[in-house]
């Protein structure tokens, strides 16, 4: 048992042209939340197939309202991790889907409206208990940066969370064949709970509930000797039933290495040398071939046509490891100049330049308004390495190309009536309210019941909103 943890670092426009429009606006504030779906193995199933490993939903992020004229920034995120508990073993290879959802906070009838902004998916190899793995995924013009890890819940430990730990019984060392539980060196790996009645001397198990026999023993509980000819070199006490010398529990006895792996004793436990096509602590992960798609991040798989021949992954630039699962951090060389943000995309390095700079490494200083056209009579305003369009009345958006319906977002409060006007909008306030948007009750204790406004102020008169 354990928990898969996902930390979202940022969600915003990706580098390059075609920046997405902000999902929120002054008329329609919104907030983001995320959903993660996990499936075991390297499944290429449809997004709708069950999340067999589990799923989780984040909290809602802070309310976000776009600042007119400002470029879409990274959007405010929910606090905390997304956690997906798993009850059984961690599979080691998994597929994920991360969805970014928008919750609109307008005045929709029936509550907030939800819409899917972006969906990213991938397949990864990950050992439980390892460090956080960082990732960047693109969905259209959006970019999602996140980290993930799998960790075991005590008493489980190990790369698959299948080993159990228990407090050390003797102060000096763990029992035969049992390793200390790093990082809990004061605890020892606990033997798995084998099938009830399984001989503690002659049986062992690799999965809870099973009973596998050491060489020379047989039967469902490993209590029946095969024959005296099966006796191993004498290392332990004599067996009363056969006169055969039963081996003591050396870590390699019975060869815990599956699939023809050879066992060698180490000071603390044992080590399996696996034949080609097998891997894992006990060579228990069966032959992976190129057909299984073992190379991540666009790696090219060569060889491995059948389970007896090994495959080799030829990794694209930016990735390494036997399965191209490790990202090379080429951004540590800080190749982007003028404060540019370095993105290692695997196949290439990309610099996301600060406003006012351009070029592959942000080496060119720009005239902010050069070549920038503001439509519909808007004027380009320079400032602080950024450009923005100051739009003529009735137009909005980054380049003043959007003709706004100023009344679409119901901008007049307290029942005020909105009128589109060539210079913006006009709110005609209900009796007892005033302000450009009718947001101020004149007498808040009974505003709607007021027969008249204060002298010289007629609340029913339109109030220009400029």
């Amino acid at each position: 048992a354990g928990v898969f943890e996902l930390q979202i670092h940022s969600f915003g426009p990706g580098p390059g042209p075609g920046a997405p429009r902000s999902p929120c606006s002054a008329r329609l504030p919104c907030r983001l939340f995320f959903r993660v779906c996990l499936k075991p193995g390297l499944s290429e199933e449809a997004a709708e197939s069950p999340c067999a490993l589990g799923a989780a939903l984040s909290a809602r992020g802070p309310v976000y309202t776009e600042q007119p004229g400002a470029p879409a920034p990274d959007l405010p995120l929910p606090d905390g991790l997304l956690q997906v508990p798993f009850r059984d073993a961690w599979p080691g290879t998994f597929s994920f889907i991360i969805e970014t959802w928008r919750e609109e906070l307008g005045d929709q009838i029936g509550g907030p409206a939800w819409s899917l902004l972006a969906r990213v998916a991938g397949r990864r190899r990950l050992a439980a208990g390892g460090p956080w793995a960082r990732d960047i995924q693109r969905a259209g013009a959006w970019e999602l940066r996140f980290s993930y890890r799998a960790r075991c819940e005590p008493p489980a430990v190990g790369t698959a969370c299948t080993r159990l730990c228990r407090p050390r019984s003797a102060p000096s060392r763990c029992g035969p064949g049992l390793r200390p539980c790093a990082p809990l060196e004061d605890e020892c790996e606990a033997p798995l709970v084998c099938r009830a009645g399984c001989s503690p001397e002659h049986g062992f198990c690799e999965q809870p509930g099973e009973c596998r026999c050491l060489e020379g023993w047989t039967g469902p509980l490993c209590t029946v000797p095969v024959s005296t000819s099966s006796c191993l070199s004498p290392r332990g006490p004599s067996s009363a039933t056969t006169g055969c010398l039963v081996p003591g529990p050396g870590p390699c006895d019975g060869n815990p290495c599956a699939n023809g792996g050879s066992c060698s004793e180490t000071p603390r436990s044992f080590e399996c040398t696996c034949p080609r096509g097998f891997y894992g602590l006990r060579c228990e992960v069966s032959g992976v071939t190129c057909a299984d798609g073992p190379c991540f991040n666009g790696g090219l798989c060569v060889g491995g046509a059948d389970p007896d021949s090994a495959y080799i992954c030829h990794c694209p630039p930016g990735f390494q490891g036997s399965n191209c699962e490790k990202r090379v951090d080429r951004c540590s060389l800080q190749p982007c100049r003028n404060g540019g943000l370095c993105l290692d995309l695997g196949h290439a390095l990309r610099c996301r330049c600060r406003a006012g700079f351009a070029g592959p490494r942000c080496e060119h200083d720009l005239d902010d308004c050069a070549g920038r056209a503001c439509a519909n009579g808007g004027t380009c305003v320079e400032g602080g390495g950024a450009h923005r369009c100051s739009c003529a009345l009735g137009f909005g958006g980054r380049d003043c190309r959007e003709r706004a319906d100023p009344c679409a977002a119901r901008p007049c409060a307290h029942g005020g009536r909105c009128y589109a006007h060539f210079s913006g909008l006009v709110c005609a306030c209900a009796p007892g309210y005033m302000g450009a948007r009718c947001e101020f009750p004149v007498h808040p204790d009974g505003a709607s019941a007021l027969p008249a406004a204060p002298p010289g102020l007629r609340p029913g008169d339109p109030q220009r909103y400029l």
Epitope: P29, T65, A413, R437, E439, F440, P444, Y465, L466
Partner: nanobody, 117 residues
Framework: EVQLVESGGGLVQPGGSLTLSCAAS????????MAWYRQAPGKKRELVAG???????AYIDSVKGRFTISRDNAKNSVYLQMNSLRAEDTAVYYC???????????WGQGTLVTVSS
């Protein structure tokens, strides 16, 4: 949740000046429509001045030309500069905020202004 805390009230002579401050937390004042209200003993609470999210202002006639409402986004505060104070301006002055994203209203606890010789 928006919290509002008023300060700056006190005793002042007729014709004198006073500036009230309202510090907001929980939201940026640039996204809020803010106002000052007052309630004199035995009377209903009434609007004095308001500043909309877009910066436009509104005043009741009896304070026009004497009172000025302003906003400082950096300090997340709203102010009411009161000049040429009169005895009839004596009241508890309350800060008010209207949050557009939720269409909810918020009130401060109030600060007492006494205009007396």
């Amino acid at each position: 949740e928006v919290q509002l805390v008023e300060s700056g009230g006190g005793l002042v002579q007729p014709g004198g000046s006073l500036t009230l401050s309202c510090a907001a937390s929980g939201s940026s004042v640039s996204f809020l429509s803010m106002a000052w209200y007052r309630q004199a003993p035995g009377k209903k609470r009434e609007l004095v001045a308001g500043i909309s999210a877009d910066g436009s202002t509104a005043y009741i006639d009896s304070v026009k030309g004497r009172f000025t409402i302003s906003r400082d986004n950096a300090k997340n505060s709203v102010y009411l500069q009161m000049n040429s104070l009169r005895a009839e301006d004596t009241a508890v002055y309350y800060c008010y905020a209207y949050r557009w994203t939720t269409r909810r209203t918020y009130w401060g606890q109030g600060t007492l202004v006494t205009v007396s010789s």
